[in-house]
């Protein structure tokens, strides 16, 4: 009686269950009764992920200079390549298929997260006692001066983009 | 129905070549592999090696790999045999098979 | 290589007798995905091999159930229940398991 259902690692065909390739293996010819499924590994800069039935392997990606991107971590029969971007650059999407450059952080906003190859910069506005006078992708908003811990007084009030200027307290005559 | 069409016979001379021919009809071609038998007079049956025609990937037996050279022709359903340098120990009955089903065989004679 | 080796060289039966045809091979020939690939022919003379027996005990479509494989490992047995005429000849072990893929040097069956 021929199946009709197959065990794990195995694939349906002619009435047979036959053998899956194992990953980093593409199928060179399905099993008959007399001979078992023939598989090939995958070739230089080839791969292929899982137990498999494919008659061709999937090419490494690449990792275009190009488009700001480099090497993470370079491909194996098993597993693709996987890319990242050149420092200052960020992917833009979860493939990495490209970069952009990392978003600064207008003044006024600081950075709340810098970012990371495979993220960009997140940044906040700053709060009321806080302040960033410069466009950057890794200042934070600092905090305004405290005039008083320097003996000073508050000459000219902060703001989300400028600090506090400070002066010397007005002397009793 | 399945058959493997082999010539009757074939008379070589020595340090010569001879490729045989087996032509299959009845299934499709690409889904067996094609395996060559040798079989001198009044002998045993001796495995020369396998081709399978979708993927021309072969397997040859050690002692025929420098005298045997296996091939496909998918387009007209025939697999090759080559055989070269033949002397006399080559004189004998070659057979293509898909194992389940056997050509007649082609009848090698080698002798000047 | 993986030797097979058949017992007995010749088997004289009376027509209507059991018969049984031992195969050893030299090495277990379960593959390495749990296959056991041991076929039986029989080639009768001037004829080409017919297959039998596949894996071991599965029978060939159209042979007669008087026709039985049996065995694992290295020890194997073709056993034909009631010998009939047309059964007479050559009966080959073969394995497929292990390259280079061997046969048996053969048995031959013929009348008491």
């Known amino acids: 009686e021929p199946p009709t259902a197959c065990r794990e690692k195995q694939y349906l065909i002619n009435s047979q269950c036959c053998s899956l390739c194992q990953p980093g293996q593409k199928l060179v010819s399905d099993c008959t009764e007399f001979t078992e499924t023939e598989c090939l590994p995958c070739g230089e800069s080839e791969f292929l992920d899982t137990w498999n039935r494919e008659t061709h392997c999937h090419q490494h990606k690449y990792c275009d200079p190009n488009l700001g991107l480099r090497v993470q971590q370079k491909g194996t029969s098993e597993t693709d390549t996987i890319c990242t971007c050149e420092e200052g650059w960020h992917c833009t999407s979860e493939a990495c298929e490209s970069c952009v450059l990392h978003r600064s952080c207008s003044p006024g906003f600081g950075v709340k997260q810098i970012a990371t190859g495979v993220s960009d910069t997140i940044c906040e506005p700053c709060p009321v006692g806080f302040f960033s006078n410069v466009s950057s992708a890794f200042e934070k908003c600092h905090p305004w001066t405290s005039c008083e811990t320097k003996d000073l007084v508050v000459q000219q009030a902060g703001t989300n983009k400028t600090d506090v200027v400070c002066g010397p307290q007005d002397r009793l005559r | 129905q399945v058959q493997l069409q082999q010539p009757g016979a074939d008379l070589v001379k020595p340090g010569a070549s001879v490729k045989m021919s087996c032509k299959a009809s009845g299934y499709i071609l690409t889904t067996y592999w094609i395996t060559w038998v040798k079989q001198r007079p009044g002998q045993g049956l001796e495995w020369i090696g396998d081709?399978?025609?979708?993927?021309?990937?072969?397997k040859y037996n050690e002692k025929f790999k420098s005298k045997a050279t296996l091939t496909v022709d998918t387009s007209s359903s025939t697999a090759y045999m080559q055989l070269t340098r033949l002397s006399s120990e080559d004189s004998a009955v070659y057979y293509c098979a898909r194992r389940d089903y056997w050509g007649q065989g082609t009848t090698l004679t080698v002798s000047s | 290589d993986v030797l097979m080796t058949q017992s007995p060289l010749s088997l004289p039966v009376s027509l209507g007798d059991q018969a049984s045809i031992s195969c050893r091979s030299s090495q277990n020939i379960v593959n390495s995905q749990g296959n056991t690939y041991l076929e039986w022919y029989l080639q009768k003379p001037g004829e080409s091999p017919k297959l039998l027996i596949y894996?071991?005990?599965n029978r060939f479509s159209g042979v007669p159930d008087r026709f039985s494989g049996s065995g694992s490992g290295t020890d194997f047995t073709l056993k034909i229940s009631r010998v009939e005429a047309e059964d007479l000849g050559v009966y080959y072990c073969?394995?497929?398991?292990?390259?280079?893929?061997?046969f048996g040097g053969g048995t031959k069956l013929e009348i008491k």
């Open positions: 894996k071991v005990t």
């Open positions: 073969f394995q497929a398991s292990l390259v280079p893929w061997t």
């Open positions: 081709i399978h025609p979708g993927s021309g990937s072969t």
